[in-house]
């Protein structure tokens, strides 16, 4: 079941997942000047069976100016800078990361995608927080948030993290060692 809200916002911090639970949706958003191809799906969906999970549908963007063409443009240097969030997500995906049952990995970028990814998370998803560059983490507990539910009421737990002005960025907890999710599995990354 989908979580009603977005994960909590922490000042000077970003969050991500390490893997996405089946049922998670990722909007097919395009950057300015581009739009989703007419026949294209509005979102990608993490689906699977007992042994394997993957993203259904592929996002495709086409120039808003062009008609019925899927010609895609290589991002220029200034556009690449714009894509920092998505690139950070891609870098987080370790090649040797073990696939988790019932989970999808971070989908690879698609050409001309928007700078920010919008996920629709499902109950049981864990996201991990880290302070942005220039801020240091003060932990009172785990820097993670879980989407929990009881009979249709969903809520994200509050991450125990404060980011204070410093010089070095902190690690994502998921990068240091896997953390247990409500399903007893380490979860995965997301930014919204």
């Amino acid at each position: 079941e989908l979580c009603d809200d977005d994960p909590p916002k922490i000042t000077h911090a970003t969050f991500k997942a390490v893997a996405y639970k089946e049922g998670t949706m990722l909007n097919c958003e395009c950057k300015r000047g581009f739009r989703r191809i007419k026949s294209g799906s509005p979102y990608m969906l993490c689906t699977g069976n007992s042994s394997h999970s993957s993203w259904d549908n592929q996002c495709q963007c086409t120039s808003s100016a062009a008609r019925n063409t899927t010609k895609q443009v290589t991002p220029q240097p200034e556009e690449q800078k714009e894509r920092k969030t998505t690139e950070m997500q891609s870098q987080m995906q370790l090649a040797d990361q073990v696939s988790l049952p019932g989970h999808c990995r971070e989908p690879p970028p698609w050409e001309n995608e928007a700078t920010e990814r919008i996920y629709h998370f499902v109950v049981g998803q864990t996201v991990y927080y880290q302070c942005v560059q220039g801020y240091r983490a003060l932990h009172r507990g785990p820097a993670e948030s879980v989407c929990k539910m009881t009979h249709g009421k969903t809520r994200w737990t509050q991450p125990q993290l404060i980011c204070t002005g410093e010089t070095e960025p902190s690690q994502f907890p998921g990068e240091e060692e896997p953390q247990a999710s409500p399903d007893g599995l380490p979860e995965s990354e997301t930014s919204r």
Partner: antibody, heavy 121, light 112 residues
């Protein structure tokens, strides 16, 4: 494996209060909602309420408002149910249970063994 | 409050027979999110209840496929295709769609 261990049976005087505990192992209670259920001798199940241990938010069935108070201590992974101004009507087994969710299920999948509260005159 | 009425109160069966328990609600128990949080629990003597079925028709892990749930709106049914000795006990339906959640009165499955 998730498990809920409840405190032992209580014999209490009419008018007094009692505090029951429910300690979880195998999972963090802050990531779930903990519910309490009452069962009077030879009778059915009655939902008392739930607590969100992460922030202390609670929801009570109207008939248990003022009678029951749910609290939680995440440091000990324990939920508590306090019953006040006890009468013979409160003589029952009290269960804690967790609303558990996974890729393919959601419901009260794990229950404590129950605590029998006997109210004496 | 939503009232769940279970029938029959007592259900005597022979082992190997099919058993059917009805649960009717006083109002629709479709949640505002479109889901129907109707569950079935079995409580054996001296034990805590155990989850059998969630969201009307989904079997919980480890529950034998002789148990099946069906229904919609206000009318729900639990069927046991071939009753075994370990199935004896009291069955409760439960709705979590409306606050406060409520249990049915229970149906005792016993040997004829």
């Amino acid at each position: 494996q998730a498990y809920l261990q409840q405190s032992g049976a209580e014999l209490v005087r009419s008018g007094a209060s009692v505090k029951l505990s429910c300690t979880a192992s195998g999972f963090n209670i802050k990531d779930y909602y903990i519910h309490w259920v009452k069962q009077r001798p030879e009778q059915g199940l009655e939902w008392i309420g739930w607590i969100d241990p992460d922030n202390g938010e609670t929801e009570y069935a109207p008939k248990f408002q003022g009678k029951a108070t749910m609290t939680a201590d995440t440091s000990s992974n324990t939920a508590h149910l306090q019953l006040s101004s006890l009468t013979s009507e409160d003589t029952a087994v009290y269960y804690c249970t967790v609303f558990w969710y996974g890729n393919n299920y959601a419901g009260f999948a794990y229950w404590g063994q129950g605590t029998l509260v006997t109210v004496s005159a | 409050d939503v009232v769940l009425t279970q029938t029959p109160l007592s259900l005597p069966v022979s082992l190997g027979d099919q058993a059917s328990i009805s649960c009717r609600s006083s109002q629709s128990i479709v949640h505002s999110n479109g889901n129907t949080y109707l569950e079935w629990y079995l409580q054996k003597p001296g034990q805590s209840p155990k989850l059998l079925i969630y969201k009307v028709s989904n079997r919980f892990s480890g529950v034998p496929d002789r148990f099946s749930g069906s229904g919609s709106g206000t009318d729900f049914t639990l069927k046991i295709s071939k009753v075994e000795a370990e199935d004896l006990g009291v069955y409760y339906c439960f709705q979590g769609s409306h606050v406060p959640p409520t249990f049915g009165g229970g149906t005792k499955l016993e040997i004829k």
